[in-house]
């Protein structure tokens, strides 16, 4: 990657981070009456998430994420869940590249939507701070 492509990658990661934080803030909103129900849904967590290729694991969980977000009141988000997830999907596909043979491996234990989002927020923050 060139310095310009790395800069683009950094910007895409920042967009991804903001989108994930927006979702987390939306579902954690004290006015969200569906939060208890949303927390019953389980998400697969990556066995490891340190590099861009590990975004394969996030991509595979975007559909379930959209389904859970559809439960939330739409006023908690600036965009409809479908559009929000579509935006994230575009970023993820660009970031992880076209290494189609890379298969995700998942951790043994599943997680709530809050734990899932926090994991990918931590991932985004760490890549932003270490990508050179």
């Amino acid at each position: 990657p060139t310095s310009s492509s790395t800069k683009k990658t950094q910007l895409q990661l920042e967009h991804l981070l903001l989108d994930l934080q927006m979702i987390l803030n939306g579902i954690n909103n004290y006015k969200n009456p569906k939060l208890t129900r949303m927390l019953t849904f389980k998400f697969y967590m990556p066995k490891k998430a340190t590099e861009l290729k590990h975004l394969q694991c996030l991509e595979e969980e975007l559909k379930p994420l959209e389904e859970v977000l559809n439960l939330a009141q739409s006023k908690n988000f600036h965009l409809r869940p479908r559009d929000l997830i579509s935006n994230i999907n575009v970023i993820v596909l660009e970031l992880k590249g076209s290494e189609t043979t890379f298969m995700c491996e998942y951790a043994d234990e599943t997680a709530t939507i809050v734990e899932f989002l926090n994991r990918w927020i931590t991932f985004s923050q760490s890549i932003i701070s270490t990508l050179t």
Partner: antibody
Framework: EVQLVESGGGLVQPGGSLRLSCAAS????????LAWVRQAPGKGLEWVAA???????YSPDTVRGRFTISRDNAKNSLYLQMNSLRAEDTAVYYC???????????WGQGTTVTVSS | DIQMTQSPSSLSASVGDRVTITCKAS??????VGWYQQKPGQSPKALIY???FRYSGVPDRFTGSGSGTDFSLTISNVKSEDLAEYFC?????????FGGGTKLEIK
Amino acid sequence: EVQLVESGGGLVQPGGSLRLSCAASGFTFSSYTLAWVRQAPGKGLEWVAAIDSSSYTYSPDTVRGRFTISRDNAKNSLYLQMNSLRAEDTAVYYCARDSNWDALDYWGQGTTVTVSS
Amino acid sequence: DIQMTQSPSSLSASVGDRVTITCKASQNVGTNVGWYQQKPGQSPKALIYSASFRYSGVPDRFTGSGSGTDFSLTISNVKSEDLAEYFCQQYYTYPYTFGGGTKLEIK
């Protein structure tokens, strides 16, 4: 059998440069993330840099802007270009393979870098 | 960055003893923890991954456990060849960080 063999270490003056190499064999080099980890005399281990299979590079604040990790998949080789060296960069530098889903599973024997005037 | 606090920094054991080394992460790292053995004058060797899984060829005397923030490596029936320094490492996020190490001395 997986093998990682480092070379290029030596004595260099503060402010100087050095390029370390790591020759890999026994695995599909291009599919793995590779890392450099260092160990100062009598001290613990410190992660210095990593480069993934797409050649994206990662490093901590301590070396960013001074050290550059790179790879040549055709030669099954990993490199660490070290510039603006300081006394605190004195250490044994290890090349390690980062398994896709687990820890640093194979390590080289190390090469010693001494920064001193 | 995630800090890995390892204790004790050194310990002494007799052949046949059972010893435990602990590592505490400054934040949740799931089970993304590895343990390494470094014998005098040698490079580190991977012992344990995912907190509790032994690498191929590692004797079953070495047992890793823990999740979240608290981890341990237990060596049962210590042998003279276990004389080494042991390090924990988190690979939950970059930058990877290591514990300060534990030197195991054989009496």
